[in-house]
């Protein structure tokens, strides 16, 4: 018969045969013959191949350094990667997460919108009007203005952005 | 089909080195990891290590960690086992074989160890 | 890593079936699938006749079987021949790029 042109699905063309990938866990040692089927052996400790392949060295697990913020959130198997993420207060500086950086705090005048993850930083809003934050923070929202109403109180100085209001009693010589 | 073809006879002194070629026909060089196997005479047959020839990354048995180095020459299909600080003892034919597995073997090299 | 385990002899008629074992420990035979069987004769370089505990390389009979419980492998050799007196040896991926082989069996058609 003619030689292959093409494989199957993990399949791969080598010396004009299609010979299986090895699955993934696996590397490949030796191709296949017309005698034998590929030759696959699993990933030693600490190394994995996510994929159905023919790499003759499988890669090695990443390492979480706690040099650099960085813990196991998921330990890797012959089939995946570690997954690092970062200490508490920290975050990944990027998708790979390779190191951390302390998370972002919001100033006074801006509320934290979103409380940062391992693999997000702290986003802070400006606190809208009738909101305010006196304090430089990475998980304090805006907090609204203290009602002086409901507390049979008069607003004596208007709050900011980054001041409460402050009430006082009601004047007893008004009609 | 692949073949390997191993060099010929040695004999050599106890203290000195030897280094026994298998070359490999057939089939591409660099996708398939070459092992070395030893038989000393009436005996059984003991695994020294393996060597892949597309990255040269080597693997030896504990036992001969240190005495062992396999090396390879990807411009003539050819593995290289080298033995030294020989010993009466090491006294065996030496095979290569393709893989792990051990599915094609090439056909033995005797090397003897003597004063 | 300390040799493999086999009987040093093994015997049968012609027509007859032997079983030779190859024990091994939970870190080789026991955590693989990657037990082989090879076959020598006298003067001869080994010849592979099993692989990947049970398979088959092709050209070689189905008179020859083996598999595997725990850590012990075993193999076949059914209908035995004449030719088939030779000595066999298993072997197992023992982790680490590592590979240990069985001391061997001398298998005698009485």
């Known amino acids: 018969p003619e030689p292959p042109t093409a494989c199957r699905e993990k399949q791969y063309l080598i010396n004009s045969q299609c010979c299986s990938l090895c699955q993934p866990g696996q590397k490949l040692v030796s191709d296949c013959t017309e005698f034998t089927e590929t030759e696959c052996l699993p990933c030693g400790e600490s190394e994995f191949l996510d994929t159905w392949n023919r790499e003759t060295h499988c890669h090695q697990h990443k390492y979480c350094d706690p040099n650099l913020g960085l813990r196991v959130q998921q330990k890797g198997t012959s089939e995946t990667d570690t997954i690092c993420t970062c200490e508490e207060g920290w975050h990944c500086t990027s998708e790979a997460c390779e190191s951390c950086v302390l998370h972002r705090s919001c100033s006074p005048g801006f509320g934290v919108k979103q409380i940062a993850t391992g693999v997000s930083d702290t986003i802070c809003e400006p606190c809208p009007v009738g909101f305010f934050s006196n304090v430089s923070s990475a998980f304090e929202k805006c907090h609204p203005w203290t009602s002086c109403e409901t507390k049979d109180l008069v607003v004596q100085q208007a709050g900011t952005n980054k001041t409460d209001v402050v009430c006082g009693p009601q004047d007893r010589l008004r009609a | 089909q692949v073949q390997l073809v191993q060099s010929g006879a040695e004999v050599k002194k106890p203290g000195s080195s030897v280094k026994v070629s298998c070359k490999a026909s057939?089939?591409?060089?660099?996708?398939?990891?070459v092992s070395w196997v030893r038989q000393a005479p009436g005996q059984g047959l003991e695994w020294m290590g393996m060597i892949n020839p597309s990255g040269g990354t080597t693997s030896y048995a504990q036992k001969f960690q240190g005495r062992v180095t396999m090396t390879r020459d990807t411009s003539t299909s050819t593995v290289y086992m080298e033995l030294s600080s020989l010993r009466p003892e090491d006294t065996a034919v030496y095979y290569c074989?393709?893989?792990?597995?051990?599915?094609?073997w090439g056909q033995g090299t005797l090397v003897t160890v003597s004063s | 890593q300390s040799a493999l385990t086999q009987p040093p002899s093994a015997s049968g008629s012609p027509g007859q079936s032997v079983t030779i074992s190859c024990t091994g420990t939970s870190s080789d035979v026991g955590a693989y699938n990657f037990v082989s069987w090879y076959q020598q004769h006298p003067g001869n370089a080994p010849k592979l006749i099993i692989y990947?505990?049970?398979k088959r390389p092709r050209g070689i009979p189905d008179r020859f079987s083996a598999s595997k419980s725990g850590n012990t492998a075993s193999l076949t050799v059914s209908g035995l021949q004449a030719d088939d007196e030779a000595d066999y040896y298993c072997?197992?991926?023992?982790?680490?790029?590592?590979?240990?082989f069985g001391g061997g069996t001398k298998l005698t058609v009485l």
């Open positions: 990947d505990v049970r």
């Open positions: 057939g089939g591409t060089f660099s996708s398939y990891a």
């Open positions: 072997s197992s991926y023992a982790g680490n790029n590592n590979l240990v």
């Open positions: 074989a393709r893989g792990f597995r051990m599915d094609q």
